[in-house]
């Protein structure tokens, strides 16, 4: 028995006609099975295969090779969270966080907790002590004075 065009199988009771549109992106093999075009998958070949490495949790795509990030995520693979706007010396594990790096504090991690180490403000052999965020105190050697032992 020879089947009509696009019909396959015993009794010609299987149909497959290649298509490339909203309903699917596939060709047909010699048995009438849908074979997805490159970049497509799923029973009807209408799900795009995203960029390799695209986060399955935070990225998606409607076109093959794409990787569109969910709100709050960024990067080529949508695997990097977006920190709180204005976060200076901080990182995030989840979107909009601002987790401060060592020696930084404040809501935006913009307050230096180690002003002495970062700026070394004490001159002429003065000893620096961190007294609070962005605050320090210099103990000046004999013969020197001023906030930074500059006098």
């Amino acid at each position: 028995v020879t089947c009509d065009d696009y019909y396959y199988g015993f009794g010609c009771n299987k149909f497959c006609r290649p298509r490339d549109d909203f309903f699917g992106h596939y060709a047909c093999d010699q048995n009438g099975n849908k074979t997805c075009m490159e970049g497509w998958m799923g029973p009807e070949c209408n799900r795009a295969i995203c960029r390799q490495g695209c986060s399955p949790k935070h990225g998606s795509c409607k076109l093959p090779g794409d990787c569109r990030c969910q709100y709050g995520w960024q990067g080529l693979y949508c695997d990097k969270c977006i920190p709180h706007p204005g976060c200076v010396h901080g990182i995030c594990n989840e979107p909009w966080q601002c987790l401060c790096e060592t020696n930084w504090g404040g809501q935006l991690c913009d307050k230096d907790l180690n002003y002495c180490g970062t700026h070394q403000p004490c001159l002429n052999g003065g000893t620096c002590s961190n007294t609070g965020p962005d605050k320090y105190q210099c103990s000046c050697p004999e013969g020197y004075s001023g906030p930074n032992c500059e006098i």
């Epitope: 006609r17 799923g42 029973p43 209408n46 799900r47």
Partner: antibody, heavy 116, light 107 residues
Amino acid sequence: QVQLVQSGAELKKPGASVKVSCKVSGYAFTDYAIHWIRQAPGQGLEWMGIINTYYGDSKYAQKFQGRVTMTVDTSTSTAYMELSSLRSEDTAVYYCARGYDGFAYWGQGTLVTVSS
Amino acid sequence: DIQMTQSPSSLSASVGDRVTITCRTSENIYSYLTWYQQKPGKAPKLLIYHAKILDSGVPSRFSGSGSGTDFTLTISSLQPEDFATYYCQHHYDIPWTFGGGTKLEIK
């Protein structure tokens, strides 16, 4: 087994909106599109639109463009059809159906009556 | 949009008769045509898809033929349970329009 279970009958006033749900079971929800079809009393079948359950993309018949919104909630395997600015001519049984090669599975239908 | 012209709109026949319903489309839809049977108060039931493939569980007295623009549903020997309304529908492109229906009544 595959089942599509729709929400109950609705009585609405002209100008109002109605939202009909269609909860599916027995297969992977995002593997198949959901279509919405309606049938006015004593009339034929009228195709309203389709929603791709994986992406949430929908396509509507021109007649309903601007008045219909089809959505899905993949966490509950439920499709929704909302029709706004209702008029008496929208009185009909609304069906959801699953398919690509015709509709092998249908919901039981939801009667929406629009009357003042 | 693709227009679907189904004929006849109603038909009286007797048990054992051979019945043919036709569906014509305004443009080539290849074999993207489906036939449904609907009984009062019930959702439609799929009979035939892709013009001639019988859905599982559908009796072999139902058959479909055609491609392109002209399609036929044939019931070879009417049974009492076959009295219902029949619809064709294309699923080639959006919108998936239905034919107007054929009401099959007992003569």
